[in-house]
């Protein structure tokens, strides 16, 4: 037999079987021109020593072979002996390692047999009542076509699908849609109303993620306060990835769960703006305000579940970085200015009262002074911090208030508000005999005391009546007993306390006089 | 050497059905193309049905069409032809044969035969 032609002999190998796991697969046939034809294959399995042989039964009853060699992809005449205009059966028996191996066959008129091809370049991917819908431009002058497609899951093998006849400009395709894991789909074309036409090649996989995507299962931890006012929120635990199947692992454009962190400052609600959404991938410095974080996880199909987390404000004071001067106008406070250019948010909040109580100003941009410092003022009027308890101040900064991720703590403190020299003064001042020239004088807690680190010494001060000597005794903050000594007997002393803060001095409790009784001997 | 053996046939009504059943004794008969023929007494042998090794291929006498469908179970190296709405002129020995080509339309000349089973059909 001619090369050319179709052999009508029998092959030069004994029978097939189709059974084995290797082997000849996906014969396609078509025209390619006005009188020439192709048929290709696929061979799954070790190719070395492998001779194919393309195969063909005609309506007569006849039957014949083309010998490919070791090609996959055969091409022949109209006069190869092969009738192009009616139908015929083309299979390729594969021989190798003394046994053949036989391809599933194709029937069909060869004339009709157009070579379709898949859906090339951009499918859609959209949800449409639970169910996917894949969209695709139609290639160039392939109108009309039955559409297949197949799918699997990670754990799944391929199951196959019929999209129907299609017969526009776009063709489309509706198939299922998993709710929990990731599918992998391919998608050929035929010929439409061309009995036994071949099918295309399968498409580039086109992967789908699961209708809900997984809820992030992450952890942070916020490292402590630095220098610079900031903390590191850092992710402990990275989400868990969703599991792909095989063609769809590597790059697998359309299953990308996107992680975003979405960032809700609560301290300081007077700036103008308190949400912010990041990449998961880039971890925010954070001010020691306290926070509220959610890791919301979303797909081509939108948002799934979150996760939320509280972050509490950092509550290491500062007490001395905070100076307050309260005049006739006003009190002003002064602390060290971070840089030029910078707008300060003073947040203040009764101690003990619920976080959602706190009461905030924002300053305008602004320079340090001459003493490298920031002031803000507030006159008495305004009522901010009027009452006469201990609050607890914070003030952050950023050069750029619109940005959440750029604040920074300056300083948290507490202050004693209103009339606090007055207020602070101790009550219940007593003194008792303690020895023959001595006594112990107790007071109760000066309301300062509950504002921590507000209250800088209690002085007590014991005058002479007599000589009109006075002496002062500073006493620790954390006591309030003072043993005053070198007393003499019969003489009117009077006591008072008064409690100090750091930039204030008190006022004198009540007058308390007393004496020591002369003692008579028998 | 593949071994066919047909069984199924027997008697009945016009209107019924049967399945006839085409067992074959070699491994590789899942790469053999078989079909259904049946004879009359001093007729020639008449092609009913055909399918290829894969299932994916079949074919069918005019007379046949819409009430005969040809299938095959490959694990059980099996071929079966469901007969529905029988007719009394459906009455003949039913041979199964096997052959390694698929043939397109009712001709080819198929290697391995079966010895036959009877089908009446009553009117």
């Known amino acids: 037999c001619r090369t050319s032609e179709c052999c009508f002999q029998d092959p030069p190998y004994p029978d097939a079987d189709s059974g084995s796991a290797s082997g000849p697969r996906d014969l396609r046939c078509y025209r390619i021109s006005s009188d020439r034809y192709e048929c290709s294959w696929q061979y799954e399995g070790p190719t070395a020593g492998v001779s194919h042989f393309l195969r063909c039964c005609l309506s007569s009853g006849r039957c014949c072979y083309f010998a490919a060699g070791s090609a996959t992809r055969l091409q022949f005449s109209d006069q190869a002996g092969v009738s192009v205009l009616y139908t015929v059966t083309l299979w390729v028996e594969s021989w190798a390692r003394n046994q053949t191996e036989k391809s599933p066959e194709v029937t069909l008129q060869l004339y009709n047999s157009v070579k379709y091809e898949p859906p090339l370049g951009d499918i859609k991917v959209s949800k449409l009542a639970g169910q996917l819908r894949m969209e695709w431009e139609t290639p160039d002058n392939q109108v009309g076509a039955e559409v297949q497609f197949r799918h699997r899951t990670p754990s799944s093998p391929w199951k196959l699908g019929d999209c129907g006849p299609q017969d526009d400009d776009t063709e489309s395709c509706l198939c299922p849609l998993e709710m929990n894991v990731a599918q992998e789909f391919q998608l050929r074309r035929r010929q439409l109303g061309s009995q036994g036409s071949s099918w295309s090649k399968w498409s580039s996989p086109v992967c789908v993620p699961p209708e809900n995507p997984p809820q992030p299962q992450v952890r942070f931890s916020v490292e402590q306060l630095g220098q610079d006012g900031r903390r590191r929120l850092t992710l402990k635990e990275q989400p868990t990835q969703l599991e792909l199947p095989e063609g769809c692992q590597g790059l697998a454009p359309g299953t990308e769960v996107t992680y975003r962190l979405q960032l809700h400052m609560l301290s300081c609600p007077c700036k103008a703006k308190a949400t912010r959404t990041l990449h998961l991938g880039k971890m925010p410095y954070l001010s020691g305000a306290a926070y509220n974080v959610a890791v919301i996880s979303s797909n081509q199909f939108g948002p799934g579940l979150n996760q939320t987390w509280h972050i509490p404000a950092d509550t290491h004071t500062e007490p001395v970085a905070l100076n307050i001067s309260v005049g006739t106008n006003g009190t002003t406070m002064y602390w060290p200015a971070r840089a030029q250019s910078m707008t300060y948010c003073i947040e203040w909040q009764p101690v003990g009262q619920d976080g959602g109580l706190a009461t905030c100003s924002l300053t305008a941009p602004q320079d340090p002074d001459p003493a490298g410092m920031a002031t803000y003022s507030w006159s008495r009027e305004s009522g901010a911090m009027g009452q006469e308890k201990c609050y607890y101040i914070t003030i952050f900064a950023s050069a750029h208030p619109e940005k959440l991720t750029l604040w920074s703590t300056v300083l948290s403190t507490y202050h004693f508000g209103g009339n606090a020299s007055a207020a602070g003064t101790p009550h219940h001042v007593s003194v008792k005999n303690h020895s023959l020239d001595s006594v112990s004088v107790d007071w109760a807690p000066s309301l300062l005391s509950t504002c921590p680190g507000v209250l800088k010494e209690y002085v007590v001060r014991c005058r002479d009546e007599d000589s009109k000597q006075v002496s002062e005794h500073p006493v620790q903050p954390t006591e309030t007993q003072v043993t005053l000594s070198g007393l003499r007997a019969g003489v009117a002393y009077t006591v008072q306390v008064r409690a100090d803060t750091a930039w204030l001095r008190g006022v004198w409790s009540q007058p308390q006089r007393f004496s020591i009784e002369v003692q008579v001997s028998d | 050497q593949v071994q066919l053996v047909e069984s199924g046939g027997g008697l009945v009504q016009a209107g019924g059905s049967l399945r006839l059943s085409c067992a074959a004794s070699?491994?590789?008969?899942?790469?053999?193309?078989v079909a259904w023929f049946r004879q009359t007494p001093g007729k020639e042998r008449e092609f009913v049905a055909s399918?290829?090794?894969?299932?994916?291929?079949?074919n069918y006498a005019d007379s046949v069409k819409g009430r005969f469908t040809i299938s095959r179970d490959n694990a059980k190296n099996t071929v079966f032809l469901q007969m529905n709405s029988l007719k009394p002129a459906d009455t003949a020995v039913y041979y199964c044969?096997?052959?390694?080509?698929?043939?397109?339309?009712?001709?080819?000349?198929?290697?391995?035969w079966g010895q036959g089973t009877q089908v009446t059909v009553e009117p």
């Open positions: 044969a096997a052959d390694r080509n698929y043939y397109p339309s009712v001709l080819g000349k198929y290697t391995y």
């Open positions: 070699a491994r590789i008969f899942n790469s053999y193309a």
């Open positions: 399918i290829s090794w894969s299932g994916g291929s079949t």
